[in-house]
Amino acid sequence: QKKGAPHDLKCVTNNLQVWDCYWKAPSGTGRGTDYEVCIENRSHSCYQLEKTNIKIPALSHGDYEITINSLHDFGSSTSKFTLNEQNVSLIPDTPEILNLSADFSTSTLYLKWNDRGSVFPHHSNVIWEIKILRKESMELVKLVTHNTTLNGKDTLHHWSWASDMPLECAIHFVEIRCYIDSLHFSGRKEWSDWSPVKNISWMPDSQTKVFPQDKVILVGSDITFCCISQEKVLSALIGHTNCPLIHLDGENVAIKIHNISVSASSGTNVVFTTEDNIFGTVIFAGYPPDTPQQLNCETHDLKEILCRWNPGRATALVGPRATSYTLLESFSGKYVRFKRAEAPTNGSYQLFFQMLPNQEIYNFTLNAHNPLGRSESTILVNITEKVYPHTPTSFKVKDINSTAVKLSWHLPGNFAKINFLCQIEIKKSNTVQEQRNVTIKGVENSSYLVALDKLNPYTVYTFRIRCSTETFWKWSKWSNKKQHLTTEAIPSKGPDTWREWSSDGKNLIIYWKPLPINEANGKILSYNVSCSSDEETQSLSEIPDPQHKAEIQLDKNDYIISVVAKNSVGSSPPSKIASMEIPNDDLKIEQVVGMGKGILLTWHYDPNMTCDYVIKWCNSSRSEPCLMDWRKVPSNSTETVIESDQFRPGVRYNFFLYGCRNQGYQLLRSMIGYIEELAPTVAPNFTVEDTSADSILVKWEDIPVEELRGFLRGYLFYFGKGERDTSKMRVLESGRSDIKVKNITDISQKTLRIADLQGKTSYHLVLRAYTDGGVGPEKSMYVVTKENS
């Protein structure tokens, strides 16, 4: 184009529908220039203008010839331009912030603007740039991009931004601009101009203030505090630690805390000091609620549900900032809130939820919430399967009869629809406990009753009870213990009876043992002893307990002695024993030795013995009648171990085995024995009966049974040369080769001749007895042989 013609044609659009084209006027033209602009398209259009720009509808794709004639005083000039969409710039209108507001409590800015989308023909993506500036010096704090879409109508956009610094601390400015990223436009796209700036500032009152106030934040966060002050701030501290000051506008200052530590329950103090004052705030650094742990719901009474949980990790937030809990049941929509006053027991929290009529399945969600967040736990529970009954109360025991009682107790709750499994603990004194399980139908009125049989009469029992539901969730706690004495019953057996003839053979002494408690069935008051023959029955006077012996003058005819035990309810079956023994001529006295504590007796099975066997024993040295104790064993037995606290080692006892037929006893075996053999306590007394030049005849006596302390097995006789009262070694001292020993195992032998001796020589003689329990002490003597003739 000629310099004297219009030149530098440029076109821009702000809405893709209209192009605003402008050019530079020819040099030297004044104000009074007219222009004719012709656009070569489908219809040749020309426009008459008085200015150097023209708004034309957007041209479709392709090249267009634009002719601009300039008509002025000294002639005209023409310029031709080729115009294409690609030469057009898309520059959106300068946006305008409709509203900028702030929530000072959360330090959040809220921005509102219009995208003027109604002027655009197509849907287009828009990129917005938002610029946040701080302080009067307008320091850039944040530049963010925000994407939206134009949709053919004016749309209001909202954007918010949380400031790291409380908004009270400094003035904040906001500007926006936009960029339309239209896919339908092939020209150059440019950013709009920045909008007019808007600002937010806090109007301080007369008091100096520190911000934020009483803020709750997450441990590990960064936080900025500031002090809005009219006087110079000299220092800032968090806790007892100083922090460097960041200067804001005027006297205002800030501090930035990085990675804040967990607070004490009273919070963390932040203070700013001036020459004469201190200004402060408190920050609470803690954690959001942990997911409630071990959420569990159960009922004690099918009236209300108790849900328990553990809060998990501590939040370090207390009081109004502590975690609040809400228990929501989703089927019913009902909920309950946890009151903070209900302080947790042993770190576990609990809530009660009233049960709903005809609802068995509950879907609970426990929501935990504090200023830093929320969490939840869920549990689905069939409450009839989660019954943890209360401890049974008012537990009582009443007699039914001597072997049965009635137990009653109270279990609060409405259990009409379920069954209970109850466990009754039955403890007899000095014996192990027994447990019985009973199934009981649940009731509405809380009172329960059960009968307990198969007990022993006149026995002290301790009862207690606990219950669970039949489906079993948890046992209740045990009820209180109740001690109860069952009533008496007649004794179930007659006393264990024995009889002995007196030493003069004129009287029969009847012995019996007290009945064990489980056979006495009550307190035995007395015994009846009667004596019957074919002709008559003679009853003795009643013998009061604790006498367990009676004496009757009897001839040597055979009588049946009956002993009956009586308690307050009645008499036992009689115990019968014949007065006379069944003779047995074929008896040898045997030797038996025990096993330290007792003695094992064995015998052959005898089918003739139909009632029982009796083993009787006594101390051999005691006078008649020989009776220390007796033991009855069943008729099918062939052995028994007799043990007694009265047995002593080294004491000889007599043992008698009797077999019983038709209440008559026959002596089957007679034994003497020791529980344990010991060595004799004395040496045999011995004398020299005869002496010659080459022999000595020695004679000795028996050792008394008491001093023998075992069965005599033999004698040891030692002899050798030796004199009384000399320093020569005694016979029994070791190392002497000339000492001779004779072991005499024939215990009936009472003499010994020692031959082949030297004449007129002193000999030392020693005699000792031995049992299987050891060798007894020695008895010694010195004898001088006669002179050879």
Epitope: S235, L237, H240, N242, V271, E275, I278
Partner: antibody, heavy 116, light 107 residues
Framework: QVQLVESGGGVVQPGRSLRLSCAAS????????MNWVRQAPGKGLEWVAV????????YYADSVKGRFTISRDNSKNTLYLQMNSLRAEDTAIYYC?????????WGRGTLVTVSS | DIQMTQSPSTLSASVGDRVTITCRAS??????LAWYQQKPGKAPNLLMY???NLESGVPSRFSGSGSGTEFTLTITSLQPDDFASYYC?????????FGGGTKVEIK
Amino acid sequence: QVQLVESGGGVVQPGRSLRLSCAASGFTFSSYGMNWVRQAPGKGLEWVAVIWFDGSIKYYADSVKGRFTISRDNSKNTLYLQMNSLRAEDTAIYYCARGQLVQDFWGRGTLVTVSS
Amino acid sequence: DIQMTQSPSTLSASVGDRVTITCRASQSISSWLAWYQQKPGKAPNLLMYKASNLESGVPSRFSGSGSGTEFTLTITSLQPDDFASYYCQQYKSNPLTFGGGTKVEIK
């Protein structure tokens, strides 16, 4: 653990000078204001001087103003008290204490006796 | 300067007693008050700051209250370890000032 150890005390004649030191360990010394507090025998506590964490500001009790100087060397984790023109009434145990406002840790003290 | 006055100067008490010490400021110090405990021959030990905040590691039987000019330190159940001297201190403005002290002794 936090430790403050005072040194430099002793017997000095009136009008003479003494320099007390306080060696700090177990914490970030440069993040705490530091104080000197003294206690005359059988008497209560008397605050003497404070220095800011960065040494920028210092304050003194009227009784020592112009005679005592508090200073610190953050690179050496050490606090100092330069005491000039000492008087009999300056006799006391001198404690070094951490904290610009509240003294949360104290040294065991060093005894200064001013006597002719 | 702000003057701090403590009362009583001496207090006789037995183990298990509830003990209260009072501190008055000559002008309002808001809550900017600390309490210290000192045992014979030892350095003071911080108990309480900002009138009622318990220092870490101090037993909960110690508590503080008050604001403005009237403050109290309370020991709910006196223990053998608590027989010592107690000082209050204001830190609202320099110079920092201490109370005259209260000696708690065994009755």
